[in-house]
Interface confidence: low
């Protein structure tokens, strides 16, 4: 290997006596694990990102480096360390021989270490002469500063700043990180550099065509000519904006990263702890008509990430693909024909589509909400944007039979006003990924840190689980769903609401073996019942008769099948009221549903009896969704009974919280 | 005081052209999208099209070919040019300015409309 | 091509009368709809856009409501100055701008 820095001989020498000093060794028993990208043509061997462990000091993560080159060297090998991460994440960017990583791998500190890949601008095509009009633009909510309090942050290509749309309204920072352009014959040619970067900051903030009008925007350019860049360079890029927002902080941030590549874990990493500093990230789900979880950062749960839809509430098809879809996508927007800024000349427009023109819209307004509301967290935004979005509009035969549960139905729209969100007790649904399908094979699904799960249902598309519970991890409730024998594997599905100051634990009753059921309730002062789970040993959950019923007075409590443990989700918070409501089917269905009616949110869905014909429980938007197999397989037998359990529950403590504010 | 005026129209023979022209008075028509409709006697009302505050134009299916949108932002004015005409397309043709961009979701909710002008196809 | 379809077609009622028209989308349109009122010899006047809000000037006695593909325009109480023909309107995209074919609301 060679190295642009000077002379081997030399190298070796500078470091054998830096080595000399560094005798640490990892800690026993902690091996730290590579990493590369699953899409083969996306690699980019030969460049590396070394991870070090969280409390890692800047100080440490430069011996570290030092140690690598050092060590290197002293085998015969040249390495480039290109960059040392502080402020985000701890670690380096080092160029060096693939060789090496079995080395880099046992050095003190190092938690992971990943292989370099590249990211891709996700809208097509790059110019097109068809122009159309807005699919979306701002509804009769616009506040008068239209986002002014707000800056959004581009990561993107270059962008054409004296455009009519965006001129004044984006500062070009001096940040760049993009690899060479590839092809011999490549001419760069301004227009086509700045092309996807100025359409997105448009279709932001721009004049004509913007969501949010005032917004402010900043671009950092991650993405070549071609719309190609790299996760280590829009790691730098997250980093840069971390070390902006520490050295002059202002409002409120939004994060738009139009772009994605194959699953990245430290990709992932840096977008959570950006998050968890109070930025906002958005970005899109990706162009690849698969499942949004295998891409990044789509996949990382503290990003809100956006797949596209068109004006006929169709999935955006792009080419042979189309827009992502799964559960790791958190709402749809527009994204087909979008109209903005073309960078062909100043007051030129052009239509563009894929899923960064939909992450751009819901940036967009991202920044109208969090000016109406600066204090707004990542949580309470994300909330409110699927509580305003409109609901079963998509057309979800487009998607694959077995990602249409787990894919939302939402598309994105501005609130009907700034009042009245505050009093409403915000719930979202949260699916795990797949347990797989062994014997013992578990499911968890997560709430965001500043969420409570309020309940935990499971699913199974073979019926064959042994239900959920609730378990502390870490200090925080997550909600576990457990595979049988024979089962093709479980889903998680976690509730997760916003309720301050909400005091919330699990109360279990096991198994009764008694011909009534088991039982449990909230005995607490003040506690009410949100949810309710049931989880069994026995590998198949026998019918249970006589039916179970929950005995009048005695909303409380939740019941289910003999041979179960019962959980039930007990909070108590100011003001929180909760009510049981049943729909029950006697003869056998595949779908039973129940509701919560206006002003009620839905915390808890559950099935009874439980029996192992039913498929489980799922929540989606306000409504409890029971699934049971196939009827023909059911048979008209007294099985076949369903009944749809959901917990309703309002916040009188925030309704008048509201009221006092208005 | 919000204006538009429609004129052009009067009697034309069948596959004869005519350009209806709509002057804005009290608004900058450049930032707003302007549409064409017409209304056959004792019909209903019936969309031409659009054309959108930087340029394109959009059409009924029936109305493509025949009959061209443009606009002049400087002489605050928007065109419409009908060819080939038939007795079918008599009607009062109205010129309307689009709702403004952060009222409506899409293009096409005309808030301001002119008194129309009639044009009859006949021989 | 999108069809909108309105009934009644004519409707008669008297002063005070609650007043129902219904359009129907031949696709989802979303929210973009909306309602004009017509009088003899004169150009449309918008009373609703996006289904529901109220255009600038109308009076709170009209309503709308709806989404997808069925839509209702209201009117609580009716005025001497509300016999007109009423149109519904989509224009959810430009390739989806059509107009229904109008209620006729007379005097009883």
């Known amino acids: 290997q060679e190295d642009e820095d000077g002379d081997y001989e030399e190298l070796v020498l500078a470091l054998r006596s830096e080595e000399d000093g560094l005798a640490e060794a990892p800690e026993h028993g902690t091996t730290a694990t590579f990493h590369r990208c699953a899409k083969d043509p996306w690699r980019l061997p030969g460049t590396y990102v070394v991870v070090l462990k969280e409390e890692t000091h800047l100080s440490q993560s430069e011996r570290t480096a030092r140690r690598l080159q050092a060590q290197a060297a002293r085998r015969g090998y040249l390495t480039k360390i290109l960059h040392v991460f502080h402020g985000l994440l701890p670690g380096f960017l080092v160029k060096m021989s693939g060789d090496l990583l079995e080395l880099a791998l046992k050095l003190p500190h190092v938690d992971y270490i990943e292989e370099d890949s590249s990211v891709f601008a996700q809208s097509i095509p790059w110019n097109l002469e068809r122009i159309t009009p807005p699919r979306y633009r701002a509804d009769e909510y616009q506040p008068p500063d239209g986002g002014s309090l707000v800056e959004v942050y581009l990561l993107d290509t270059s962008i054409q700043s004296d455009h009519r749309e965006i001129e004044g309204r984006v500062m070009v920072t001096d940040f760049e990180n993009v690899p060479e352009e590839d092809g011999t014959r490549f001419h760069r040619q301004a227009s086509k550099c700045d092309s996807h970067g100025t359409h997105l900051a448009g279709v932001v903030s721009g004049r004509d065509a913007g969501v949010a009008k005032g917004a402010s925007m900043r671009s950092l350019r991650v993405l070549n000519c071609q719309g190609k860049g790299t996760v280590s360079g829009t790691l730098i890029g997250l980093e840069f904006i971390r070390k902006s927002q520490l050295v002059q902080p202002v409002g409120p941030l939004v994060v738009l990263l139009p772009l994605a590549g194959g699953y990245s874990r430290v990709l992932n990493a840096a977008c959570q702890r950006l998050a968890r500093a109070g930025v906002v990230l958005v970005t899109a789900a990706g162009n690849f008509r698969d499942d949004a979880c295998l891409y990044s950062p789509a996949s990382a749960p503290e990003v809100i990430t956006v797949g596209a839809t068109n004006a006929q509430d169709q999935p955006v098809t792009l080419g042979t693909l189309g827009t992502n879809f799964g559960r790791c996508v958190d709402l749809f927007a527009p994204g087909e024909d979008i109209i903005g800024a073309s960078s062909d000349c100043s007051t030129c427009f052009v239509s563009q589509s894929g899923t960064s023109q939909a992450a751009a819209h819901v940036a967009g307004i991202a920044a109208m909400m969090l000016s109406a509301e600066p204090e707004l967290t990542l949580a309470e935004l994300r909330q409110r944007l699927i509580h305003f979005s409109a609901k079963d509009v998509i057309n979800e035969a487009w998607f694959p039979e077995d990602q249409r549960v787990l894919t939302p139905n939402l598309v994105a729209a501005l609130p009907p006003s700034t009042h009245g969100a505050g009093w409403q007790l915000f719930c979202r649904t949260v699916w795990s990924a797949h347990s797989g399908p062994t014997r013992m094979a578990t499911a968890v699904a997560r709430c965001a840190p500043d969420e409570e799960l309020l309940s935990c249902s499971s699913f199974s598309r073979s019926g064959k689980r042994r239900g959920e519970r609730m378990e502390a991890q870490g200090g925080k409730l997550v909600c576990r769903a457990h595979n049988a024998f024979g089962g093709e594997g479980v889903y998680a599905i976690a509730r997760c609401c916003l309720l301050p100051q909400a005091n919330c634990s699990v109360h279990t009753a096991p198994p009764a073996e008694a011909s009534m059921g088991t039982r449990v309730h909230c005995h607490q002062q003040g506690h009410v019942l949100t949810g309710c789970s049931s989880h069994w040993e026995v590998e198949d959950l026998g019918t249970h008769k006589p039916p179970v019923l929950r005995p009048r007075g005695q909303p409380n409590q939740c019941v289910g099948h003999r041979e179960a443990s019962i959980h039930a989700s007990c909070c108590h918070a100011p003001g929180l009221e909760c009510k049981v409501k049943e729909h029950g089917i006697p003869a056998p269905q595949e779908q039973v549903t129940v509701a919560c009616e206006e002003g009620w949110t839905l915390t808890g869905c559950s099935a009874l009896p439980g029996t192992s014909h039913v498929l489980g429980a799922y929540a989606v938007d306000n409504t409890c969704v029971v699934r049971s197999r196939d009827v023909s397989t059911t048979g008209s037998t007294s099985e076949g009974a369903v009944t749809a359990v959901a917990i309703c529950c309002r916040s009188r403590h925030l309704a008048q919280a509201s009221q006092e504010l208005q | 005081e919000v204006q538009l005026v429609e004129s052009g129209g009067g009697l034309v023979q069948p596959g004869g052209s005519l350009r209806l022209s709509c002057a804005a008075s009290?608004?900058?028509?450049?930032?707003?999208?302007m549409g064409w409709v017409r209304q056959a006697p004792g019909k209903g009302l019936e969309y031409i099209g659009i054309i959108v505050s930087y340029g394109p134009t959009y059409y009924a299916s029936w109305a493509k070919g025949r009959f061209t949108i443009s606009r002049d932002n400087s002489k605050s004015t928007v065109y419409l040019q009908m060819n080939s005409l038939r007795a079918e397309d008599t009607a009062t043709y109205f010129c309307?300015?689009?709702?403004?961009?952060?009222?409506?979701?899409?293009?096409?909710?005309?808030?301001?409309w002119g008194q129309g002008t009639l044009v009859t196809v006949s021989s | 091509d999108i069809q909108m379809t309105q009934s009644p077609s004519t409707l008669s009622a008297s002063v005070g009368d609650r007043v129902t028209i219904t359009c129907q989308a031949s696709?989802?349109?979303?929210?973009?709809l909306a309602w004009y009122q017509q009088k003899p010899g004169k150009a449309p006047k918008l009373l609703i856009y996006a289904a529901s809000p109220l255009a600038s000037g109308v009076p709170s006695r009209f309503s709308g409501s709806g989404s997808g593909t069925e839509f209702t325009l209201t009117i609580s109480s009716l005025q001497p100055d509300d016999f007109a023909t009423y149109y519904c309107q989509s224009y959810y995209g430009s390739s989806n701008i059509a107009f229904g074919g109008g209620t006729k609301v007379e005097i009883k």
């Open positions: 696709q989802s349109i979303s929210t973009a």
């Open positions: 309307a300015r689009d709702l403004d961009a952060q009222s409506s979701g899409y293009y096409g909710a005309f808030n301001i």
């Open positions: 009290g608004i900058d028509l450049s930032s707003y999208a």
